[in-house]
Interface confidence: low
């Protein structure tokens, strides 16, 4: 049934859903409050460039007695119950802000007519790429990909002489929501990934990573996973590791090697670190530390998500434009607007864009450092430490293949 | 609307004191950043002070007037007040009142932030030697 949009008259409502299925086990009553300080920075925005207009949340939670499990796992019914309840309640706001499980945001996309733009703090699968009115607000697997790719190709650096093509991927089935997204990724057969490597196998039990590591017949110098530092130390121990083998450790949304104090542990030295750029005035800053670092992104993505539509809206009434039609739907995409930390780009797909950054463990110092930066919005990498103190020979990272040329 | 007015400034020989007020109104939402900012003529705005404005607890001060400043409010009036002792002639400026939003979990400001959202007309201070 069509359902009427409180999104006019000088009143414009946002739809949040509060899903018990969540990407990150994050309490709704901090989600609440992400909004609720959002909504009041749209206010001042708008009453700021003159624009005397209301803008409310409405929460819709589930009953949470059938989608119980609190992961992903049941989310896919459960955010279609709750589109339902806004059906019947005939109640829809401008925008939905909601659904962080890539299934239920994949089911939702399928199953509704969006004729209202959706803002998600997730739905990181490849399965949520190029859909015209999602937009994503955490970094999704694809931007994960092009990085990796363009950082396996690269072979002018300094420290990277190589190109790679070749890779392990450790996947157990165990990860959260964000890492198995990006795995699974990495492991589908018809991914960009897939497609540019020659080999790659994924290890599904402890015992087969722990074997490569000391594996003369491997077939490949490169690891990747996805987790923290306790992940990794917890599968790989104080095992001794191959001279030539890398590890490459998926770390996103955690800004703690950014800390002043952290000195990285010694089975820390074989592994490069990819992790996210911290936020503007993060560092040496009051920021809260209350919140684990990735429940604080998800957090700040719903926050996000709120300063974001309140952008969109300042544009369309500045310009006149009416909210309830397909191009206010189709326009969060292709823009930068100010977020909480600063800018915040979006691209032509409406995924959030970012500074990826590569990290190594400084045999000298034993602290996290800088390597290189990549920048999604342009494909692109830059350098930062030309001669990064290495624990591998040379200080050049070896090549994939052990053996193929001088190492 | 947020709406934010300053008064207390004026002159006073160096040593002296001060004590600078603000009076809030329009609020729709429970925890602001409060602070109190100042420039000096051909100066950039620099933050003096920040408290959260539903916590009594955690003030921010810049290293520069630490000791001798403190920010404290009357939530009941919707009132914030700078106290400035010791003032010295480095201190003059106009002092300016601001607000934000933009506290996270836990009741924290960002220290260093700059872009307040609401910010009032400004009272100035001389400090002469």
């Known amino acids: 049934s069509q359902v009427s949009q409180n999104c006019h008259n000088g009143s414009y409502e946002i739809s949040v859903l509060m899903m018990g299925n969540s990407a990150f086990a994050e309490p709704l009553k901090n989600l609440e409050d992400a909004v609720n300080e959002g909504l009041e920075i749209v206010r001042g925005r708008l009453q700021n460039a003159g624009l005397n207009v209301t803008v409310n949340a409405t929460f819709m939670y589930s009953d949470g007695l059938i989608h119980n499990s609190g992961d992903c796992r049941s989310s896919t019914c459960e955010g279609l119950d709750l589109l339902r309840k806004i059906s019947n309640a005939q109640r829809m706001g401008c925008v939905l802000i909601g659904p962080s499980c890539t299934y239920s945001t994949f089911q939702m996309y399928l199953d509704t007519e969006l004729s209202y733009p959706m803002i998600s703090a997730g739905s990181f699968g490849l399965s949520c790429d190029y859909k015209e009115t999602l937009t994503r607000l955490m970094s999704p697997a694809r931007k994960l990909m092009y990085f990796l790719v363009n950082f396996w190709k690269t072979n002018d650096l300094p420290f990277k002489t190589y190109s790679w093509s070749t890779s392990y991927v450790y996947k157990n089935g165990t990860e959260t929501e964000d890492c198995f997204w990006y795995l699974n990724a990495l492991e589908a057969s018809v991914s960009y990934f897939s497609h540019e490597l020659g080999f790659k196998v994924v290890l599904r039990q402890d015992k087969e990573f722990q074997d490569i590591l000391m594996d003369h017949n491997r077939k490949s110098n490169v690891i990747i996973m996805c987790g923290g530092p306790e992940f990794l130390y917890k599968l790989k121990g104080d095992r001794a590791v191959a001279e030539d083998i890398v590890i490459i450790l998926v770390d996103l949304f955690n800004d703690q090697y950014f800390e002043d104090n952290v000195t990285a542990p010694d089975y820390m030295k074989n592994v490069l670190v990819l992790t996210l750029s911290p936020g503007n005035s993060l560092l040496n800053s009051s920021f809260s530390r209350n919140l684990s670092p990735t429940k604080r992104d998800f957090a700040l993505a719903y926050l996000n998500g709120i300063l974001l539509f309140g952008h969109m809206l300042k544009i369309f009434l500045e310009n006149g434009e009416n909210i309830t039609t397909p191009k206010f739907a189709h326009a969060f995409r292709n823009l930068t607007f100010e977020g909480y930390d600063g800018p915040v780009t979006l691209d032509d797909w409406g995924d959030v864009d970012s500074t990826m950054v590569l990290l190594y463990t400084s045999v000298d110092t034993k602290k996290y450092k800088v390597l290189l930066t990549y920048d999604t919005h342009v494909n692109k990498t830059y350098p930062v430490d030309m001669s990064p103190t290495f624990t591998w020979k040379n200080s050049k990272l070896p090549n994939d293949i052990t053996g193929r040329g001088p190492q | 609307q947020v709406q934010l007015a300053e008064s207390g400034g004026g002159s006073v020989q160096s040593g002296g004191s001060l004590r600078l007020s603000c009076a809030a109104s329009?609020?729709?939402?429970?925890?602001?950043?409060m602070a109190w900012f100042r420039q000096a003529p051909g100066k950039e705005r620099e933050g003096v002070a920040v408290?959260?404005?539903?916590?009594?607890?955690?003030?921010t001060y810049a290293d520069s007037v630490k000791g001798r400043f403190t920010i404290s409010q009357d939530n009941a009036k919707n009132m914030l007040y700078l106290q400035m002792n010791s003032l010295k002639p480095e201190d003059t400026a106009m002092y300016y009142c601001?607000?934000?939003?933009?506290?996270?979990?836990?009741?924290?400001?960002?220290?260093?932030?700059?872009?307040?959202?609401?910010w009032g007309q400004g009272t100035q201070v001389t400090v002469s030697s």
């Open positions: 601001a607000a934000d939003p933009r506290v996270w979990y836990g009741g924290t400001c960002r220290a260093g932030r700059t872009d307040f959202l609401y």
């Open positions: 408290i959260v404005s539903d916590n009594d607890g955690s003030a």
């Open positions: 329009g609020y729709t939402y429970s925890r602001y950043c």
